[in-house]
């Protein structure tokens, strides 16, 4: 540019020749002059944005070469300048190049392949091997700068170019750049760690593993362990995987060797990148000594009727996981352990649930089913007391030789015998008859059995023909025996039991 | 002329630190995205360090990470290296890398000499 | 990481004849834009590594025609048309698609 002097006023130098631009020939003789009493040097910029400099006011480069094309600037003492763009054409070296090619995702990036000679055509861009340009790919050409890339895509990333121009008819390419692509981050890295809580004997080895992904390698993690301040760990094991041009991955694997009570806390995965931050936390907890808890069972009385299935079903923790687990019917073992199962899918889980299922009972199978579980440092135990519901049975109906009518009946919960008389002409017994004597009989051993009940009536009481009932009932059900009684004058001829 | 220059090696016990320089000359080192790369007594090449020409990205071999830090000064042209907690393995001869447009390495320092031991 | 994989380790090589070193890949290293990111360096005694191949099958600035690197996807191969006495030292191969990893060298020798 050159000056346009005011009166008064400093004015910038002139340069000779008096033109914005000139082209040289390479080999020819680069001849500039700076015009201005108070000048002070020439600068030249290269196209690599180098400066050179020369305190003389004649810059003059014999044979010049392509490399010379650039920007020369004089100055003087009052700060002013005046510039010349000088193109050095060449034709054996049309474009200026070899810087590697750098851009950052939704920014412009530029192509440093300016031009020697700018009298050519169609300055452009193409991809190396003569394939398409990405369609969504625009460029902007500046024969003094290169070419500038619009709003670079991470799909550009490692895109091979060349710049490209006609000269007298004839495509001229550059050397290739690849693009690398530097991917804005428009999100926070994402971390995770398999399991958020541990238990742990003390002497264990505690291991986790954290793992950080995110577009650049220059995502940042750590892992912290809050008590309560963020301390830093150093003794972190680190592994990282490109899974892709902008998929990284990295894992950061915290271990404890042999842990102690008070290594008992929160520890924090935590990374962050230009976008902000993201953490994940996982507790640790180290105990003295391993243990069982089981579960308090809301009812150890379980209550079933002949016949149906029942499930005895206990819930525990355990640390070390537990190692025998059975089932003992009456203080003898039982060939059935029960199912047993991991409460959560958690790793790290230290809940169990074991079930033991007990199908089609019998009367004779109430008793005291106990679950023993243990580990290498505790047990524990629970008791379900089972009493199987049974309907009444009718056992004996009988006269006595006193005169006695019996009726013994057994079943659980303890039947209650009720008697009936009916003549003959009813259909059903309804009229009560009190029992001369109810007694119960324990005849089980084990306190689960049936319950046996015998209850007698006088049968001197009767006075006409008729029926009498036996009925024996529980919450199950109902049994009956009936005596016939049959009169000849004042003796009862025939007495005859039946159910 | 174009060329690396690497200083700062030395014999250093365990757990301490060091620096490494690279000089860079005869090129337009901020434009050049750098690397370090080492190499054990009597084994291969082992890559450990990239930065990229503007500092913004950088990224480590997983065995380094946390302990060493690679950074650059383009006014001065010059890369560095700083390594903390040392370790017997990291003994070795550690040379600065220039990556070109292939993301090749096509300009290397002559090396300097890392030596950990107690 | 990807693995690198050289072969042979050790290469008696008589002067004036060829020589061909291996390289495999744990995965492929074709980028989607065409290019394979594998390099080949000589390290000869007491110097530094110099690039003799870029991206699979380029020859470096400087380097003899009488070095070739051809291959693709996960197998390459360093071909040496005519081993001079100045060739002896140690070749890398090394993959620069992901995180860099270089093969563990071979070893280049005259008979």
């Known amino acids: 540019s050159q000056p346009s002097a005011s009166p008064g006023e400093p004015s910038p130098p002139s340069i000779h020749p008096a033109q914005s631009e000139l082209i040289v020939e390479a080999g020819d003789t680069l001849s500039l002059t700076c015009i201005d009493p108070d000048f002070v040097r020439w600068t030249f910029k290269t196209y690599f944005n180098e400066m050179v400099e020369n305190k003389k006011n004649e810059w003059i480069q014999e044979k010049a070469e392509a490399t010379r094309t650039g920007t020369y600037t004089c100055s003087n003492s009052n700060g002013l300048t005046s510039s010349i763009y000088v193109f050095v054409r060449d034709p054996a070296k049309l474009f200026l190049v070899g810087l590697p090619l750098f851009g950052k995702e939704d920014s412009d990036a530029l192509v440093r392949c300016p031009l020697t000679d700018p009298q050519v055509s169609n300055y452009s861009l193409i991809e190396c091997d003569g394939k398409s340009l990405p369609t969504d790919l625009t460029f902007v050409p500046n024969p003094k700068a290169g070419i500038t890339i619009k709003n670079v895509k991470r799909a550009y990333h490692r895109l091979c170019v060349r710049c490209a121009a006609q000269r007298d008819g004839t495509w001229l390419h550059s050397d290739k750049f690849t693009l690398k692509v530097r991917a804005a981050i428009k999100a926070i890295p994402v971390v995770s760690v398999p399991e958020t809580s541990h238990l742990l004997k003390k002497g264990d080895t505690f291991t986790v593993v954290c793992t950080i992904k995110d577009v650049s390698t220059s995502v940042n993690s750590m892992w912290l362990k809050m008590n309560p301040q963020p301390q830093h760990i150093a003794q972190v094991k680190h592994n990282s995987w490109h899974r892709g041009d902008f998929n990284y991955e990295r894992q950061e694997t915290l271990t404890i060797s042999s842990a102690r009570v008070d290594d008992s806390g929160v520890f924090m995965c935590y990374a962050n990148n230009t976008f902000g931050s993201a953490n994940v936390t996982t507790t640790l907890k180290v105990v003295e000594k391993g243990f069982i808890n089981i579960s308090p069972v809301k009812n150890t009385t379980v209550f079933v009727t002949d016949g149906e299935n029942v499930d005895l079903v206990v819930e525990y923790e355990a640390y070390p996981k537990p190692e025998h687990q059975q089932w003992i019917y009456m203080n003898r073992t039982s060939a059935n352990k029960g199912k047993d199962y991991v409460k959560s899918d958690n790793k790290s889980n230290i809940r169990y649930v074991n079930q033991l299922r007990l199908t089609r009972l019998k009367g004779t199978e109430g008793g005291t089913y106990t679950f023993l579980v243990s580990n290498s440092d505790a047990s524990a135990s629970v008791t379900f007391n089972v009493y199987v519901n049974t309907k009444p049975e009718i056992l004996t109906y009988d006269r006595l030789i006193n005169g006695m009518l019996q009726c013994v009946a057994e079943g659980f919960p303890e039947p209650t015998i009720d008697w009936y008389f009916c003549t003959g002409a009813e259909q059903r017994c309804t009229t009560p008859v009190s029992p001369v004597d109810v007694q119960v009989q324990n005849v089980s051993v084990s306190p689960f059995g049936k319950l046996v009940v015998q209850s007698s009536i006088d049968s001197s009481v009767f006075r006409h023909n008729g029926t009498v009932e036996c009925k024996a009932s529980n919450d199950v059900g109902k049994s009956s025996a009936f005596f016939n009684f049959a009169f000849k004058g004042n003796n009862k001829e025939q007495i005859q039991a039946h159910t | 002329q174009v060329q690396l220059v690497e200083s700062g090696g030395g014999v250093v016990q365990p757990g301490r630190s060091l620096r490494l320089s690279c000089a860079a000359s005869?090129?337009?080192?901020?434009?050049?995205?750098m690397h370090w790369v080492r190499q054990a007594p009597g084994k291969g090449l082992e890559w450990v360090a990239v930065?990229?020409?503007?500092?913004?990205?950088?990224d480590y071999t997983d065995s380094v990470r946390g302990r060493f830090t690679i950074s650059r000064d383009n006014s001065k042209n010059t890369l560095y290296l700083q390594m903390n907690s040392l370790r017997a393995e990291d003994t070795a001869v550690y040379y600065c890398?220039?990556?070109?447009?292939?993301?090749?390495?096509?300009?290397w320092g002559q090396g300097t000499t890392v030596t950990v031991s107690s | 990481d990807i693995v690198m994989t050289q072969s042979p380790l050790s290469l008696p090589v008589t002067p004036g004849e060829p020589a061909s070193i291996s390289c495999r890949s744990s995965?492929?290293?074709?980028?989607?834009?065409?290019?394979?990111?594998l390099d080949w360096y000589l390290q000869k005694p007491g110097q530094s590594p110099q690039l003799l191949i870029y991206?699979?099958?380029n020859r470096a600035s400087g380097v003899p025609d009488r070095f070739s690197g051809s291959g693709s996807g996960t197998d390459f191969t360093l071909k040496i048309s005519r081993v001079e006495a100045e060739d002896v030292g140690v070749y890398y191969c090394?993959?620069?698609?992901?995180?860099?990893?270089f093969g563990q060298g071979t070893r280049l020798e005259i008979k």
């Open positions: 890398a220039r990556e070109d447009w292939a993301e090749a390495f096509d300009m």
């Open positions: 005869g090129f337009t080192f901020s434009r050049y995205g």
């Open positions: 930065i990229w020409y503007d500092g913004t990205n950088k």
């Open positions: 995965q492929s290293l074709l980028h989607s834009n065409g290019y394979n990111y």
């Open positions: 991206l699979g099958s």
């Open positions: 090394m993959q620069a698609l992901q995180t860099i990893t």
